[in-house]
Interface confidence: low
């Protein structure tokens, strides 16, 4: 299960740049090469670095030592270098209780986005810093550290008393001058005269804690093991040259017998447990596109099979000051449209054999809500809405207008701040919603701003299905159906009855149901029925009908 830290206060901080390196890679080197900045088409950029054997030093710049998240190097290496104190040191009680560990949780962590394209440098000569991964305690990295601007070169390691022994040349006696650097920083020099020449240690003892760097050749797909010793040692069967054992096959054990004229038998038998091939691993962006605006997911994938024991493989990630010991990490609650840099490495039996850096730019976030200035109707068939656009990036607007159960939405150009709605229905309430959207890895809609208006009245449509029928010699029954469109607030039906050009009746009812009595017999009448909505009359429906002779 991947850890899902939620950094609370995300601030922009300077991310250290790192030197470019060349192939192949020693297992302990912690310098990561920079990734190129984010390209939209590629989703993310990736650089897998490999360092050449002659470039194993790690540069630490003043910036990284100023940063309280820089990690302490606590391993004991065959050539000890003074530990450089940082601000973090003053908060750490002792070497034995150093609480800065790799873990999946990051309760109080802040993940700082890189400030921009100038954060990551691939320009030669730029000041560079190392990755802040702690050196592996089992197989530590032999590093050359450049001093921080606020550090003192004479300051000793807080974790150890370093004894430097310099042998003096004397014809009769071997005198050794021992300088001990105490934790307080004072040098204690004592001279002891020893009467006998010390015996040589066994090679098994001398090289008991030897460390190895594995260098991978992508063309031959073979490893070279670089023995981290100061002198040119000899190997049984002449298997090594210049302290390097060549042509090692991945996931195979190789035995090397190490000897030197400064030590006696028995030789040191070193078992080389060769890691899997570097290209068998790929750092994959597993971020869900829907969440890519505020989350990052990175996962190491095994893209080819190998015979090494997967139990011996460990994965490490560092993003900002957040450290994880997981094959997959998920960072949440990030800022949209920000670049974040994550460094990762894979270790086999605690020997690092590959690493990669990614700069991932989080996706565009949802746009903000537009601010509606006004929306109103000034005519029966028209309405207008004006607004201010949201602050965040967006591509276009969607304007929806709803009348009763009918909903229509229009895509509007991002530069519009006003829209005239046409062909609206008179005297109808329209609810409008306006939101901005952006088409990123997915379409993200911003919050909608809402408003409503009622269109003005207009003449109603004609009544229909009008009938005129005789109920008696001098009486008529006039009926009609309501207009399809009333277009106004009220409902009133009018009937005008004309004989020749003379208006003989004018009636108004709530319903279109008129009984016209006491008409003249044997007369032609014109019946005009129309609807009035309180503001406008509709067009009349006209029928002609005659009364008959009186039957009596």
């Amino acid at each position: 299960q991947s850890p899902t830290p939620s950094p609370t206060g995300l601030t922009t901080a300077k991310m250290p740049s790192v030197p470019l390196s060349s192939d192949p890679l020693p297992t302990h080197t912690t310098a990561f090469s920079p990734a190129s900045t984010f390209e939209r088409e590629n989703d993310f950029s990736e650089t897998t670095t490999s360092l050449s054997p002659d470039n194993t030093s790690t540069q630490v710049s003043p910036d990284s030592l100023d940063n309280a998240s820089a990690f302490n190097t606590t391993g004991v290496s065959s050539v000890q270098t003074p530990h450089l104190p940082t601000h973090a040191d003053s908060q750490t009680p002792s070497a034995g209780t150093d609480t800065q560990t790799f873990s999946g949780s990051a309760a109080n962590a802040k993940l700082n986005p890189t400030p921009g394209s100038n954060a990551i440098s691939d320009v030669p000569g730029e000041r560079s810093t190392a990755s802040t991964f702690p050196t592996d305690p089992v197989s530590p990295l032999t590093t050359t550290l450049s001093l921080a601007h606020h550090s003192s070169a004479a300051l000793p390691a807080r974790t150890s008393n370093t004894t430097i022994t310099a042998n003096t040349s004397d014809a009769y006696l071997n005198a050794s001058e021992t300088t001990t650097l105490s934790p307080s920083g004072s040098a204690v020099i004592s001279t002891t005269t020893i009467a006998t020449t010390p015996s040589k240690p066994t090679c098994d003892e001398k090289y008991a804690n030897i460390t190895v760097d594995y260098l991978y050749n992508k063309e031959t797909k073979l490893f070279t093991a670089k023995l981290n010793v100061n002198e040119n040692v000899e190997c049984g069967n002449n298997t090594c040259t210049n302290n390097e054992v060549h042509n090692l096959t991945e996931c195979k054990n190789a035995s090397v017998s190490i000897s030197h004229n400064s030590c006696t038998a028995p030789d040191k038998t070193l078992i080389l447990d060769v890691p899997p091939g570097v290209e068998k691993f790929q750092l994959h962006d597993c971020t869900q596109v829907e969440k890519a605006d505020t989350t990052i997911c990175l996962k190491w994938k095994n893209i080819e099979t190998f015979t090494c024991d997967t139990q011996n493989i460990t994965y490490r990630f560092q993003c900002g000051n957040m450290i994880f010991d997981n094959k997959e990490i998920k960072l949440e609650n990030l800022e949209p449209e920000h670049e974040y840099k994550c460094d990762s490495e894979i270790l086999y039996n605690n020997h690092k054999f590959t690493n990669a850096s990614k700069i991932i730019k989080t996706d565009f976030g949802s746009p903000g809500e537009p601010q509606i200035i006004f929306c109103r109707s000034e005519a029966a068939h028209q309405g207008v809405i004006t607004w201010n656009p949201p602050q965040r990036s967006f591509h276009n607007f969607t304007l929806c207008y709803i009348k009763e159960t009918e909903k229509d939405c229009l895509n509007l150009d991002k530069n519009l701040i006003k829209y005239d709605l046409q062909n609206l229905k008179p005297y109808t309430k329209y609810v409008l919603s306006l939101h901005a959207y952006i088409i990123a890895k997915v379409q993200r809609n911003g919050s909608a701003a809402m408003c409503h208006f009622t269109t003005k009245s207009a003449p109603p449509s004609q009544v229909w299905n009008m009938t005129v029928s005789m109920t008696s010699d001098n009486s008529m029954h006039v009926k009609c159906r309501p207009p399809r469109d009333r277009n106004g607030p009220h409902e009133r039906y009018h009937l005008e009855v004309e004989a020749g050009n003379t208006l003989v009746r004018n009636e108004s009812h709530k319903n279109c149901d008129f009984r016209v009595k006491d008409l003249q017999y044997s007369t032609d009448y014109t019946f005009k029925a129309y609807f009035h909505n309180g503001d406008y009359p509709g067009e009349p429906f006209i029928l002609h009908h005659s009364t008959s002779y009186n039957s009596k």
């Epitope: 929806c400 909903k407 229509d408």
Partner: nanobody, 124 residues
Framework: EVQLLESGGGLVQAGGSLRLSCAAS???????TGWFRQAPGKEREFVAS????????YYADSVKGRFTISGDNAKNTVYLQMNSLKPEDTAIYYC??????????????????WGQGTQVTVSS
Amino acid sequence: EVQLLESGGGLVQAGGSLRLSCAASGRTLTFYTGWFRQAPGKEREFVASIRWSGGNTYYADSVKGRFTISGDNAKNTVYLQMNSLKPEDTAIYYCAALRSWTTTPQREVLYDNWGQGTQVTVSS
């Protein structure tokens, strides 16, 4: 801007079949793709439309049961399968993209991108 290209028109006998295609390119975010037709001397009328997200389909009464509209997301293409063709189906058939959402996708006025049209002639 969405570009639409129709194909598949031609001359067919009454009772025959044709399959029209409408390929979209450019910014292809559309809610609906519709087919309209215009017979000589008549106004352009709605034939069928499909809503991309839900696959909902809409048909004019005159073609219901004879025409089928379908879409292929991967190819950004909409098809109109026309069976049991009648002489009155003779018209120029236009493909149109509606980059809006509506409850009435039959309304021609809502469509904002149109193809050039393909001629369908049904002889008796």
